[in-house]
């Protein structure tokens, strides 16, 4: 049976140019995270965290994906075209796997302000 | 190479207590949750739990609560299985398992320590 | 609980023969399932995991296939290593249960 539940970030918004941070966080489960997925809203992969391997960013979003914080992801250099929604995988024993949804607005207004629902501890 | 090992077979009394040690190497051992089997003489396989080895939390089957402890020592990548107030019914094989694979679809117990017997008899 | 129910429990069959070991879980696992040969006296050994993966070093006359409920682990040639027990094991969330294994004899 799946206990967990998966907390994100919500609905936020970022200035073009600017960065934000993606984070999703599992809580309520004794089970252990094994790799997060995170996907943009076209299913492409960004950034795979394996509990072995550690982090690997796709090549396509090497120069404005940094991993972290913790199991969250940063992206860089917004534009426009970020503009959309954005999942977390967490793969976990033994439950199965969790999903989490971001949507991310990309603004062009200078006074854009990266509003977040919670902040993780 | 990626290997558990697991402590030599025991004779106990019945009332008394265990012991089992899984040693893993050859990976990083906080990455891989650690599962318990046990199989009495004759018998089939059967999931006793497991143990989160980024946390140390156990995870209990039903019918292997109570008398039944998982623990970790993570500086010397070594899980443990005790059990008290032992019983005949107790004696059988335990091993340890890895459980291999990172996304769900891929789970599976890939690395398995040799057994450790352990027989209770008066 | 998810239930799995191996069939046969006994399997009589030649050097050579093809034969097929049946896994049935009481409800839908999609394909979290593995397959493990056992020696008398030895630990499990993984022979196929999420259905139809072959381990590595695993030799190719063992295939799996199925998934939702029926599952199959399929020895094309048995070889007289191959004369031991097999189990069935779901891995689609807590417990994860094991079959009461197929123990394959020389007929």
């Known amino acids: 049976m799946m206990t967990g539940t998966i907390e994100t970030t919500g609905n936020i918004s970022a200035k073009k140019g600017g960065s934000v941070i993606l984070q999703c966080h599992l809580s309520s489960t004794m089970a252990q995270v094994t790799q997060v997925n995170w996907e943009q809203h076209d299913h492409s992969l960004l950034a795979i965290r394996n509990a072995e391997l550690g982090w690997h960013i796709y090549p396509a979003f090497k120069d404005r994906v940094a991993p972290g914080p913790g199991l969250g992801l940063t992206l860089q250099s917004l534009t426009m075209n970020d503009t959309g929604e954005y999942f977390c995988t967490y793969h976990t024993y033994p439950d199965g796997t969790y999903r989490g949804r971001i949507f991310l607005e990309v603004l062009e207004s200078s006074v854009a302000e990266h509003s977040a629902r919670f902040q993780i501890p | 190479e990626v290997q558990l090992v697991q402590s030599g077979s025991d004779l106990k009394k019945p009332g008394a207590s265990v012991r089992v040690s899984c040693k893993a190497s050859?990976?990083?051992?906080?990455?891989?949750?650690m599962n318990w089997v046990r199989q009495a003489p004759g018998h089939g396989l059967e999931w006793m739990g497991w143990?989160?080895?980024?946390?140390?939390?156990?995870t209990y089957v039903q019918g292997f609560t109570g008398r039944f402890v998982f623990s970790l020592d993570t500086s010397v990548n070594t899980a443990y299985l005790q059990i008290s107030s032992l019983k005949a019914e107790d004696t059988a094989v335990y091993f340890c398992?890895?459980?291999?694979?990172?996304?769900?679809?891929?789970?599976?117990?890939?690395?398995w320590g040799q057994g450790t017997m352990v027989t209770v008899s008066s | 609980d998810i239930q799995l129910t191996q069939s046969p429990t006994f399997l009589s069959a030649s050097v050579g023969d093809r034969v097929t070991i049946t896994c049935r879980a009481s409800?839908?696992?999609?394909?979290?399932l593995a397959w493990y040969q056992q020696n008398p006296g030895k630990a499990p050994k993984l022979l196929i995991y999420?259905?139809?993966t072959l381990q590595s070093g695993v030799p190719s006359r063992f295939s799996g296939s199925g998934s939702g409920t029926e599952f199959t682990l399929t020895i094309s040639s048995l070889q007289p290593e191959d004369f031991v027990t097999y189990y069935c094991?779901?891995?689609?969330?807590?417990?994860?249960?094991f079959g009461q294994g197929t123990k394959v004899e020389i007929k």
């Open positions: 398992a890895r459980t291999g694979g990172h996304t769900y679809d891929s789970y599976a117990f890939d690395v």
């Open positions: 050859g990976y990083t051992f906080t990455s891989y949750p």
């Open positions: 143990i989160n080895t980024n946390t140390g939390n156990p």
């Open positions: 409800q839908v696992i999609s394909s979290s």
């Open positions: 999420a259905a139809s």
């Open positions: 094991q779901h891995l689609h969330g807590y417990p994860c249960n």
